[in-house]
Interface confidence: medium
C-alpha cells in the first residue's frame, strides 16, 4: 500500500508511518514502528504537557516567585501549568502575571476612585471643592468637609483639598 501523506487526529507522520501522539501529561520516548506502538512516559514532578504531543521533554511548571509578589493560585498538574496570582496588596504587571507591583496609594489631596484588584492598580482622583483627603491611602475616598452650620458653629478656617474646615463657636458679641 501507498505510504500515508496525512494522518488521523492524535497521530503524526514519521518514517512514512502514522504514529499515535502521546496524551497530555506524557512525553515521547520512542516513535512507533511497523511492529511497536509509540512509547510514552509520564511527566515527572513539577513538569507538564498540556496537549497531545510528540515532545521528548516535558515543560517545567511556572514558578510563582514570592520575591516578585507572586503566589500560587492553582497548582500545576502533569497536564496543566501552575497559575500565579499576586499577594494581597499587589497587582499583576501584565496579563501573563509574571511579576507584581504594590498597589499605588493616593496622596493627600487625592482620594481613591477605584480600589485596586489583583490585575488593576488603584485609580486616584483629585478631591473636588468641598472634599479633602489628608492621608496617603490605597483605600480612602475623599471626605466631605465638616458642615459647621449643622453643629451651630461657624467656619474659623477654610478647608482645602488636603484639610478639613476648622469650626469654632459663633461670635456672641456680634449684633
Amino acid at each position: 500500500p501507498e505510504p500515508p501523506t496525512a494522518c488521523r487526529e492524535k497521530q503524526y507522520l514519521i518514517n512514512s508511518q502514522c504514529c499515535s501522539l502521546c496524551q497530555p501529561g506524557q512525553k515521547l520516548v520512542s516513535d512507533c514502528t511497523e511492529f511497536t506502538e509509540t512509547e510514552c512516559l509520564p511527566c515527572g514532578e513539577s513538569e507538564f504537557l498540556d496537549t497531545w504531543n510528540r515532545e521528548t521533554h516535558c515543560h517545567q511548571h511556572k514558578y510563582c516567585d514570592p520575591n516578585l509578589g507572586l503566589r500560587v493560585q492553582q497548582k500545576g498538574t502533569s497536564e496543566t501549568d501552575t497559575i500565579c496570582t499576586c499577594e494581597e496588596g499587589w497587582h499583576c504587571t501584565s496579563e501573563a502575571c509574571e511579576s507584581c507591583v504594590l498597589h499605588r496609594s493616593c496622596s493627600p489631596g487625592f482620594g481613591v476612585k477605584q480600589i485596586a484588584t489583583g490585575v488593576s492598580d488603584t485609580i486616584c482622583e483629585p478631591c473636588p471643592v468641598g472634599f479633602f483627603s489628608n492621608v496617603s491611602s490605597a483605600f480612602e475616598k475623599c471626605h466631605p468637609w465638616t458642615s459647621c452650620e449643622t453643629k451651630d458653629l461657624v467656619v474659623q478656617q477654610a478647608g482645602t483639598n488636603k484639610t478639613d474646615v476648622v469650626c469654632g463657636p459663633q461670635d456672641r458679641l456680634r449684633a
Epitope: P66, N67, G89, L102
Partner: antibody, heavy 121, light 106 residues
Amino acid sequence: EVQLVESGGGLVQPGGSLRLSCAASGFTFSSYAMSWVRQAPGKGLEWVSTIQNAGGGTYYADSVKGRFTISRDNSKNTLYLQMNSLRAEDTAVYYCAKEGGKYYYYAMDVWGQGTTVTVSS
Amino acid sequence: SYELTQPPSVSVSPGQTASITCSGDKLGDKYAAWYQQKPGQSPVLVIYQDSRRPSGIPERFSGSNSGNTATLTISGTQAMDEADYYCQAWASSTVVFGGGTKLTVL
C-alpha cells in the same frame, strides 16, 4: 556551608524594645526571601514575618503587626527584626529561616540555631 | 484566618509505618511542607512541595496532599525518627504552621 546565626536576644521588660539580627553566609543572600519564626516555651512553631529578597514586600502575623518590623541589609548579608511594645506572650526562641526559592518551593530549607527573647518584669 | 490542624501525638512501633495528618480548608490547593524538630534543636525540612524530599532526607519519609489533608508518612520507622513534626503552608500572604505532632517510637 550554608549558615544562619541569630543574635540580639535577651531579657526585656514589658513595653520595651529589642532588635534581633541574623547573619547569613554560604549562599547568595540577596536572592532569597527570609523569615522569622518563633517558638514559645513548650509550644509549637509560629510564623512571625517574611521579607522579599530586595525588601520590597513584607508580611506579618496579626499578633505582631504594628509592633514588629522586619528589614534586611543585603550588602551586609543580614536580616533584622525590630521588636517594640513587647509583651509577655512574645517570650520565645526566635529563629531566622531562609525561604527555599524555586529549589525548595514554599518551604524554609535553612534555619538558624535561634535566639531567646524573654519579656518579664 | 487560615488554620492547619494536626493530631497532638502519634505512636508507632519500630519498623512500622507512621502517618501524621495535617488538615486545612482546601489544603490540597496549596503546597505543604513538613519539618522535624528534635528536643533542643532547630527544625529541619523533611518534605516540601507536598511530596518532595530535600537531599539528605532518608527515602522512608514521603508526603502527599489532596483535598483537605496533607499526610507525612514514615515507613520503617526508626528510634531516631522520634521528634515533633510540623506541617506548613502559605495562605494568602501569611505562613501557617500546624500545631505539631509528637511522634513516639515505642
